[in-house]
């Protein structure tokens, strides 16, 4: 789900190179965790449950052509995704009368792109025009960054997990002086 | 008063395995999240990691992943730290810190400190 | 991993004089920046949170400053008890870094 953020009208994705076919299952899983309908713990984990593997900021590789109007880059080019959790979850829903708030347990950190490269690929395009030779920009590396208050929904979007967005029926955090965090929370290494 | 007391200094030999406590008071220890931080002997200072008291969720720096072991137990207000393949390395003063926060600038902080602990790894 | 830089080991002063602590970073934290102190017999102390707000109780001789990577802890008026060593620490990215310490000596 996350590197399918990545993908713009100067690319394609290409599944069938087998690096990437699909998203793993541990952005599947990833899904639930934050669904008001779940109360925000993934459903089929006990309590006990630590997995140091699935939740983490990760640097995931796919492969994929880039392309200009009719124009496709010779080879494909292999690119990072960063993917997963930066920690244990930090947020508890409560419920109180029908609606649903956050309280937090520390600031909330999202596993985004840090540093990019630039590769320069050739475009071949059909029809015998000449090839051209273009600059991309690719993701490098990535990092755990802290969000505030005050970075709205479509900063949010660009970092390309579900779990950066609000969910329906949930109240932005309250200001709370304590803070509890979800109850499945498994255990993470940045 | 907010207080975390830490257990005493240990003595280890190379490759054993170290368990320190930090015992906290004064506050619901479910409402915040712990941190461990190292200090070696050039005063340098490394984050270690955190738990969640409620949920014994932990997160760990890369650095002291495999290293270092997180726990809680919530009837005595207690939170622990293993540390295992002890080497000269790990000789240090841990420390555990709780994460507070300030609602009006939606910051985060290390506002309570413990003591420290120190282990000294020598054959 | 960010680089917490505090260019300064140890700083001698005198009572009642104006110091100032500098603490750079190897990238913008966006004023995510804390600063401790440590007395000699090893307890820490928070002074100031996200760059320039002062915790309760801590007294107002305390200044923090700064923006992007460039952020200095300034003391007014040293007073005894001010002799101790300080630390920056980001909570920009994890894992959180610490600055190396600057120790501020009596001269």
């Known amino acids: 789900q996350g590197w399918q953020a990545f993908k713009n009208d100067a690319t394609e994705i290409i599944p069938e190179l087998g690096e990437y076919p699909e998203p793993p299952p541990e952005l599947e899983n990833n899904k639930t965790m934050n669904r008001a309908e779940n109360g925000g713990r993934p459903p089929h984990h006990p309590f006990e449950t630590k997995d140091v593997s699935e939740y983490s900021c990760r640097e995931l590789h796919f492969t994929r052509y880039v392309t200009d109007g009719p124009c496709r880059s010779a080879k494909p080019v292999t690119e990072l995704v960063c993917s997963g959790q930066c920690g244990p979850a930090r947020l508890l829903p409560n419920a109180i009368g029908r609606g649903k708030w956050w309280r937090p347990s520390g600031p909330d950190f999202r596993c985004i792109p840090d540093r990019y490269r630039a590769q320069r690929v050739q475009l071949l395009c059909p029809g015998g025009e000449a090839p051209r030779a273009r600059k991309v920009r690719l993701v490098a590396s990535c990092k755990c960054k802290r969000l505030t208050r005050f970075h709205n929904q479509s900063e949010l979007k660009d970092f390309g997990t579900e779990a950066a967005r609000p969910q329906k029926g949930r109240k932005p955090r309250p200001r709370a002086r304590s803070a509890k965090a979800n109850q499945a929370e498994l255990e993470n290494a940045y | 008063e907010v207080q975390l007391q830490q257990s005493g200094p240990e003595l280890m030999k190379p490759g054993a395995s170290v368990k320190m406590s930090c015992k906290a008071s004064g506050y619901t220890f479910t409402d915040y999240n712990m941190h461990w931080v190292k200090q070696n002997q050039g005063k340098t200072l490394d984050w270690i990691g955190e738990i969640n008291p409620n949920s014994g969720g932990a997160g760990y720096n890369q650095k002291f992943k495999g290293k270092a072991t997180l726990t809680v137990d919530k009837s005595s207000t207690t939170a622990y730290m293993e540390l295992r393949s002890l080497t000269s390395e790990d000789s240090a003063v841990y420390y555990c810190?709780?994460?507070?926060?300030?609602?009006?600038?939606?910051?985060?902080?290390?506002?309570?400190w413990g003591a420290g602990t120190t282990v000294t790894v020598s054959s | 991993d960010i680089q917490m830089t505090q260019t300064t080991s140890s700083l001698s002063a005198s009572l009642g004089d104006r110091v100032s602590i500098s603490c750079r970073a190897s990238?913008?934290?966006?004023?995510?920046l804390n600063w401790y102190q440590q007395k000699p017999d090893g307890t820490f102390k928070l002074l100031i949170f996200?760059?320039?707000r002062l915790l309760s109780g801590v007294p107002s001789r305390f200044s923090g400053s700064g923006s992007g990577t460039d952020y200095s802890l300034t003391i007014y008026n040293l007073e005894q008890e001010d002799f101790a060593t300080y630390f920056c620490q980001q909570g920009d990215t994890l894992p959180y870094t610490f600055g190396g310490g600057t120790k501020l000596e009596i001269k």
């Open positions: 810190a709780r994460l507070g926060y300030d609602d009006i600038y939606d910051d985060w902080y290390f506002d309570v």
């Open positions: 990238q913008d934290i966006s004023n995510y």
């Open positions: 996200y760059t320039s």
